[in-house]
């Protein structure tokens, strides 16, 4: 009964607090893609190898903006979804020569989600309601996953390790507040 | 799982404060708005206001400006409601809820119940 | 602040009857209207927010309609586990707030 992925009445899928996000189904029109192999970061190595180029755990990046209801945010959020297969591919000779192949009896590799961070958005409402707020959960970066035979699709959503969390205790800054604040939201399970 | 957990009922005279606190699990604190709503004994829903633990940020019904404080410990994911120069009518079951927006409540607590009596 | 005023306060239901409770706004406040069930000595859940969305594992018996300041609360066909509190609330103006609840009882 934790937070789930959903769909809510605009044409994306919103990653909340309910679940970690899926790759979104459908892209608003002034949404941007650029694709990136594992952000800059070395790959997340299940083997032990000396050819990086056998994993492959692509980070594509989506900037969308994020709709609650009839509310928009002012700005848009980028975030990645994690694609592809990852290896490691098995060298076997032939007769040509070395070429790459997949094992098929090899472990099962996917690429997922590795750490996420939450982003707060001022939403923008209609008739000039109170402003309100909320927190979407982003894919912060991807990794090769190895699954057994015991796993199924419902067990790619990786509950990684967390972002690092602020220091203990903090107090609350305090805010000179306008006629409103800013608001956000969250949701309880039936 | 999203879980909260609230601290124990409390009897307190007129004039004092309490303070409850509101452990939650299933997902980091800082991640999520924090709600305080109350219900009286026999009456309905009173909301008392949101913070956002990750920056300290707090909006208060302005019923209870002055009178409460809403913090929140993000090193042990639990959240805190102090209510000031308690009276009679404080008298009430005080819930926590916690949700990823600023207007709506996700998952709730189990409730602590605040008697105020001489 | 935004009054909510729902009706009836309480009825009685049989299972399987069609139930309805109204929340009025006192103001415009398009759709930012959440229901909730609360029963007795529990906490509240959330069942629609938007005034229309269904929120996770509610089931579908569950509806929410309206926009402006007329709000209306569906249980297409009342089921045992039904009989609770059930509280609208806004979220368009500070504070939020909430409608009386309508108590659904067993007829």
């Known amino acids: 009964q934790g937070w789930q992925a959903f769909k809510n009445d605009a044409t994306e899928i919103i990653p909340g607090l309910r679940e970690y996000p899926e790759p979104p189904q459908e892209l608003e029109n002034n949404q941007t893609m650029n694709r990136a192999e594992n952000g800059g970061r070395p790959p997340h190595h299940p083997y032990d190898t000396k050819d990086v180029s056998e994993y492959s755990c692509r980070e594509l990046h989506y900037t969308r903006f994020v709709t609650d209801g009839p509310c928009r945010s002012a700005k848009p959020v980028t975030e990645l979804v994690c694609s592809g297969q990852c290896g490691p591919a098995r060298l076997l000779p032939n007769a040509i020569g070395r070429v790459k192949w997949w094992r098929p009896n090899g472990p099962d590799f996917r690429c997922i989600p590795d750490r996420y961070r939450a982003q707060r958005v001022q939403l923008l409402c209609p008739g000039g309601a109170a402003p309100r707020s909320r927190k979407v959960r982003l894919v912060a970066s991807c990794k090769c996953k190895r699954l057994t035979r015991f796993h199924n699709q419902s067990e790619l959503k990786d509950f990684g390790p967390e972002t690092a969390r602020p220091q203990k205790g903090r107090k609350p800054r305090p805010r000179a507040r306008g006629a409103k604040a800013n608001q956000a939201e969250l949701e309880n399970a039936y | 799982q999203v879980q909260l957990v609230q601290s124990g009922a409390e009897v307190k005279k007129p004039g004092a404060s309490v303070k409850v606190s509101c452990k939650v699990s299933?997902?980091?604190?800082?991640?999520?708005?924090q709600h305080w709503v109350r219900q009286a004994p026999g009456k309905g829903l009173e909301w008392m206001g949101w913070?956002?633990?990750?920056?300290?940020?707090?909006e208060y019904a302005s019923k209870f400006q002055g009178r409460v404080t809403m913090t929140e410990d993000t090193s042990t994911d639990t959240a805190y409601m102090e209510l000031s120069s308690l009276r009679s009518e404080d008298t009430a079951v005080y819930y926590c809820?916690?949700?990823?927006?600023?207007?709506?409540?996700?998952?709730w607590g189990q409730g602590t119940t605040v008697t105020v009596s001489s | 602040d935004i009054q909510m005023t729902q009706s009836p306060s309480s009825l009685s239901a049989s299972v399987g009857d069609r139930v309805t409770i109204t929340c009025k706004a006192s103001?415009?406040?398009?759709?930012?209207v959440a229901w909730y069930q609360q029963k007795p000595g529990k906490a509240p859940k959330l069942l629609i927010y938007?005034?229309?969305t269904r929120w996770t594992g509610v089931p579908s018996r569950f509806s929410g309609s309206g926009s402006g300041t007329d709000f209306t609360l569906t249980i297409s066909s009342l089921q045992p586990e039904d009989f609770a509190t059930y509280y609208c609330?806004?979220?368009?103006?500070?504070?939020?707030?909430f409608g009386g609840g309508t108590k659904v009882e067993i007829k």
């Open positions: 809820a916690t949700g990823d927006t600023t207007y709506k409540f996700d998952f």
């Open positions: 299933g997902f980091p604190i800082k991640d999520t708005f």
């Open positions: 913070s956002d633990p990750e920056i300290g940020d707090t």
């Open positions: 103001q415009d406040v398009h759709t930012a």
């Open positions: 938007w005034a229309s």
């Open positions: 609330q806004q979220y368009s103006d500070y504070p939020w707030t």
